[in-house]
Amino acid sequence: SEVEYRAEVGQNAYLPCFYTPAAPGNLVPVCWGKGACPVFECGNVVLRTDERDVNYWTSRYWLNGDFRKGDVSLTIENVTLADSGIYCCRIQIPGIMNDEKFNLKLVIKPAKVTPAPTRQRDFTAAFPRMLTTRGHGPAETQTLGSLPDINLTQISTLANELRDSRLANDLRDSGATIRIG
């Protein structure tokens, strides 16, 4: 089953995915796609990196983290209800059937219409602990259990700025993380 993340219409959605490069600058190709991970690569690719840089992207989809350090979390800008669905993060580790696949489910909720006097917005995300397994079936990600939902109402940074907060750093070890080498 896919891990679930939530955002509101008009917000930026954040889908976490990390790996630890074997050495600084020793990057692994990564793709993000709309739809569950297929056998090879990603279906309906929205963003792709190679060993050096982001080499393909589509509008509204970007990597806000430091992908050179393995933070390949996807930010989707100004989401609409149509952005709901499953997204695939695939870390293409060289070797024989070494790819790591993560299916993340994005749920978009209608925007709250209550007036807000401040510029702060709500962002609630569940950061699950992930166990990755090497296997030959489609389900190579198993959820061990989610941490409690974390309400970031008090934090003025938006979801796409989470990586800069100490909280996000604490959560990094709980997300979809792969160590290479």
């Epitope: 796609g33 739809g35 569950a36 297929p38 056998v39 090879f40 690569e41 990603c42 279906g43 309906n44 690719v45 929205v46 792709r48 393909y56 589509t58 293409q92 580790i93 060289p94 070797g95 024989i96 059937m97 070494n98 790819d99 030959h136 079936g137 489609p138």
Partner: antibody, heavy 123, light 107 residues
Framework: EVQLVESGGGLVKPGGSLRLSCAAS????????MTWVRQAPGKGLEWVAS????????YYLDSLKSRFTISRDNAKNSLYLQMNSLRAEDTAVYYC????????????????WGQGTLVTVSS | DIQMTQSPSSLSASVGDRVTITCRAS??????LTWYQQKPGKSPKLLIY???TLAEGVPSRFSGSGSGTQFTLTISSLQPEDFATYYC?????????FGQGTKLEIK
Amino acid sequence: EVQLVESGGGLVKPGGSLRLSCAASGFTFSDYYMTWVRQAPGKGLEWVASINYDGRNTYYLDSLKSRFTISRDNAKNSLYLQMNSLRAEDTAVYYCARGYYYYGSSPNYFDYWGQGTLVTVSS
Amino acid sequence: DIQMTQSPSSLSASVGDRVTITCRASENIYSYLTWYQQKPGKSPKLLIYNAKTLAEGVPSRFSGSGSGTQFTLTISSLQPEDFATYYCQQHYGTPLTFGQGTKLEIK
């Protein structure tokens, strides 16, 4: 015009080895995943192995990965399948196929196929 | 492994007939399904990918539908050149697997 031409098939004794080749032309070979699919006489299609653009990632039918090795030489526009410890059940026509690809798609289906090369394993 | 089961295994029809071939997956494969056509002594030809997208150069009388575990290939009006064997293939789970084929013969 896209062309895939397999070679290297033939008659081999059980336990023997063969190396199949696939010469590609008419497209930028290094932009595509490549795949081997086989078809035993009178039977259906069976996926054998696939390889990514630069050869760093390979994928195999589990029962074959200890005996078969897929590789590619992008400088020569060539795909290879090294087959060791061959068995009678490996007898088949072996097809080389190109994974359909553009930047926004995944190469999980095959838009061009070679004519196939017959491998017969028999004593 | 994901099993792909096609029905019928063989089918007799006439030119002009509407024909439907079914492919069932043993588990959810979303829309990750491809259809190929193969004529005797020839290599397979890509017809439809992602369950319903027509490959380049394929006549519009071919169509695909379905998602999850149930898929269909429909030929709206059979032409003489359509008599062949048809295979479905899933590309969701490793290994890639094909259906056993449906042989379409002239009645």
